[in-house]
Structure formats: structure tokens, C-alpha cells
């Protein structure tokens, strides 16, 4: 991605998705009535004009918010602790990689706006998720709906990362 973001960052993201999948405790089929449209801001991750700073910022904020969401007492009560610890460790590693990268990208002069704007949008989105959990009294189905939602948004975000990586590869080979 034009900085020292390790090649294994994509692998770490994939591992995070696997962990989130393994964390599942009940079938989503039991939770049809609890589903909610959290309105993930897809326009943020589906654009074709991808800036390095934007991609880094989206990924960083996503991972930071996921870390916070799954790093609470409520979360510890809801999920398998071994898997939760693995999730925390993986997210922490990815955040460290991204922070190194973000510093470099900002140093290269990419706009601060590209970094602050996605962060605010994502904070609002995650706030909606927290409100939903509280409304549903942190029920098993509420956590299951949230787990699925986090997987959806993380999948879209890592896809955006892959698109930028392949764009960089194309530029490098031309």
C-alpha cells in the first residue's frame, strides 16, 4: 500500500473474519426478528477513487471501534474468552501496523480531511450499534446480529484495502 504495511495485513484481516465467524454461539436463523439495518456507510468503501489516507483511516477507525465494542464487560460475558482474546490480539496487531502507516501517509502530505471525515461517519455508525445492544438488553440474539453486522462491514472494508493493493500493483507494473 505504498508504505511498510506488511503483506500479512490482508491475512490478519482474514483471520479476524474467521475468528468472528468462530465466535458465533447461536444460529442467526433464531434471530430473524432481531435484525436491524444499521446503515453502514457503503459509499465510504465502494468508491473507485481510493486515496491511501482514506483507506488507512477507514480501516483504522473500523478496527479501533471493533476493538472497543468487543473489549467491554458485556462483551466478555457474551463470548468465548479464548476466541475473544485472540480477536483482541489480532486487532491490536493490525492497529499498530496501520498507525505506523498512517503517520507515514500524513508525512507524505495527504489531506487530513481524508482521515478525519471517515472517522466521524464510522463513529456514528458504531454508536447506532451500541444503542441497539442497549435497547435489546445485550441479549444473545442482539450480540449475534451485531457479530454478523461487524463481519459485513469488515468484509467490505478489507475488500476496499484489496482494491487499493491491486491498484498499487497495477501502477507498479505499468
Amino acid at each position: 500500500l505504498g508504505c511498510d504495511l506488511p503483506q500479512n495485513h490482508g491475512l490478519l484481516s482474514r483471520n479476524t473474519l474467521v475468528l468472528l465467524h468462530q465466535m458465533r454461539r447461536i444460529s442467526p436463523f433464531l434471530c430473524l426478528k432481531d435484525r436491524r439495518d444499521f446503515r453502514f456507510p457503503q459509499e465510504m468503501v465502494k468508491g473507485s477513487q481510493l486515496q491511501k489516507a482514506h483507506v488507512m483511516s477507514v480501516l483504522h477507525e473500523m478496527l479501533q471501534q471493533i476493538f472497543s465494542l468487543f473489549h467491554t464487560e458485556r462483551s466478555s460475558a457474551a463470548w468465548n474468552m479464548t476466541l475473544l482474546d485472540q480477536l483482541h490480539t489480532g486487532l491490536h496487531q493490525q492497529l499498530q501496523h496501520l498507525e505506523t502507516c498512517l503517520l507515514q501517509v500524513v508525512g507524505e502530505g495527504e489531506s487530513a480531511g481524508a482521515i478525519s471525515s471517515p472517522a466521524l461517519t464510522l463513529r456514528r455508525y458504531f454508536q447506532g450499534i451500541r444503542v441497539y445492544l442497549k435497547e435489546k438488553k445485550y441479549s444473545d440474539c442482539a450480540w449475534e446480529v451485531v457479530r454478523m453486522e461487524i463481519m459485513k462491514s469488515l468484509f467490505l472494508s478489507t475488500n476496499m484495502q484489496e482494491r487499493l493493493r491491486s491498484k498499487d500493483r497495477d501502477l507498479g507494473s505499468s
Epitope: L20, H21, S27, F29, R147, M151, K152, F155
Partner: antibody, heavy 124, light 107 residues
Framework: QVQLVQSGAEVKKPGASVKVSCKAS????????INWVRQAPGQGLEWMGW????????GYAQKFHGRLTLTSNSSISTSYLELSGLRSEDTAVYYC?????????????????WGQGTTVIVSS | DIQLTQSPSSLSASVGDRVTITCQAT??????LNWYQQKPGKVPKLLIY???NLEVGVPSRFSGSGSGTHFTLTISSLQAEDFATYYC?????????FGGGTKVEIK
């Protein structure tokens, strides 16, 4: 890559029961829900029910209640469909299908991997 | 039960044509709709999940749209391998139900 392999074709008499198996192999998770869908000759698809092999949670389409039993043995990654009181209109290809897309997208209500189908013929 | 009505039930088209198939639900199903393709004697294959998301490996000429009760599957430029039957499926409520299918034939 996940694969679902189903048991062979069956010919049954009206009133009899049939049991179809569906074995998962490859990169499987025991928590994955297995759905059953059937297709009568020249007709469309009909959803019958689902089961989670891990928790044993199960759901049936009302139409099949009392006749359909979905079971599983997670130690051998196999799910089963048993349909009793067979009638000629149960003649169909029966498919098992894993809930979820082929990659981990968080979408669990799409049927992303299908078994090859088991033909069940009910005839006197 | 939620009924899904697909139209047309069959259509004839040529390679390169733009093809649109619609799926109408008897009640609001939000965005909870998938599309499948089935070729004669073959197993159904997931094309599009949750209205508009392309399954991995599905060509970008396929697209889905809609919400509520009205959904469409579009093939922007029909290819020889696209001649098949297409089914929509809702998962708003149990029992999950499929549309009756749309058979796309060669003109």
C-alpha cells in the same frame, strides 16, 4: 473449500420413509447451518427447513411439520433429512445447502454451497 | 407465507442483449432477497445475496437492485453461458420461499 456430498438415489413405495444424508468436507465449521431444499421434476425450488449441527436447533416449513425430521451427527460432519408418509408428490431431487456465502462476508441467509442432490422417486 | 412472483416466467434473448428479470413479494421483505442460477440437470448456484451483493466469482455483468416488494436481476450483456433458469429467494421470514423461476432461452 467446503463440499457437501449426498447419499444416492432412492425408490420408495407410498407411505414409506426415506432418509437422505449430507456429508460436509473441506473447510467446514460445525456451527454452519444446513438447509434442505427440494425440486419436483420440471418445477421450482421449495425450502423445507434448516438445522444447526452444533446446537441442534432446527426449523421446518409448516407444510412438512409432522412428516419431516432433520438430524445431524457433528462428529462425522453429516446431516440427515428423513421424510415419512411418502406420497407421489414427494418425488423430487432433495438438496442440502450450507447457509452462508462462499467467503466470510457475514451474510448467513444465502445458500452458497449445495450438495449434488439426491433423487427420491415415490411409486407403487 | 410470503409469495414471490417472478416475471416473465420465460424469455428469449440473444447474446449481447440486456436482460431484466423482476421479483415481486406479497409483503415488504426489506433487502432480504437472494438470486440463484440453475442450468438443466445442475445444482442451483448463488449469484447475488442481500439484493445487490455479487457472490465471489460471479461476473460483473450480473447486478441486483430493489427493496421492499420489488426487486430486479439484470444481465447487462447476455453471454452464451447465461442461458439458464433464475430464481429469487426471500429470507425476511420463515418459511424461506423461492420465486417460480425465469427461464432464459436462446432466441
Amino acid at each position: 473449500q467446503v463440499q457437501l456430498v449426498q447419499s444416492g438415489a432412492e425408490v420408495k413405495k407410498p407411505g414409506a420413509s426415506v432418509k437422505v444424508s449430507c456429508k460436509a468436507s473441506g473447510q467446514t465449521f460445525t456451527s454452519d447451518d444446513i438447509n434442505w431444499v427440494r425440486q419436483a421434476p420440471g418445477q421450482g425450488l421449495e425450502w423445507m427447513g434448516w438445522r444447526n449441527p452444533n446446537t441442534q436447533d432446527t426449523g421446518y416449513a409448516q407444510k412438512f411439520h409432522g412428516r419431516l425430521t432433520l438430524t445431524s451427527n457433528s462428529s462425522i460432519s453429516t446431516s440427515y433429512l428423513e421424510l415419512s408418509g411418502l406420497r407421489s408428490e414427494d418425488t423430487a431431487v432433495y438438496y442440502c445447502a450450507r447457509a452462508g456465502t462462499s467467503t466470510l462476508t457475514g451474510h448467513y441467509f444465502a445458500l452458497g454451497v449445495w450438495g449434488q442432490g439426491t433423487t427420491v422417486i415415490v411409486s407403487s | 407465507d410470503i409469495q414471490l412472483t417472478q416475471s416473465p416466467s420465460s424469455l428469449s434473448a440473444s447474446v449481447g442483449d440486456r436482460v431484466t428479470i423482476t421479483c415481486q413479494a406479497t409483503q415488504d421483505i426489506s433487502k432480504y432477497l437472494n438470486w440463484y442460477q440453475q442450468k438443466p440437470g445442475k445444482v442451483p448456484k448463488l449469484l447475488i445475496y442481500e439484493t445487490s451483493n455479487l457472490e465471489v466469482g460471479v461476473p460483473s455483468r450480473f447486478s441486483g437492485s430493489g427493496s421492499g416488494t420489488h426487486f430486479t436481476l439484470t444481465i447487462s450483456s447476455l453471454q452464451a453461458e447465461d442461458f439458464a433458469t433464475y430464481y429469487c429467494q426471500q429470507y425476511e421470514n420463515f418459511p424461506f420461499t423461492f420465486g417460480g423461476g425465469t427461464k432464459v432461452e436462446i432466441k
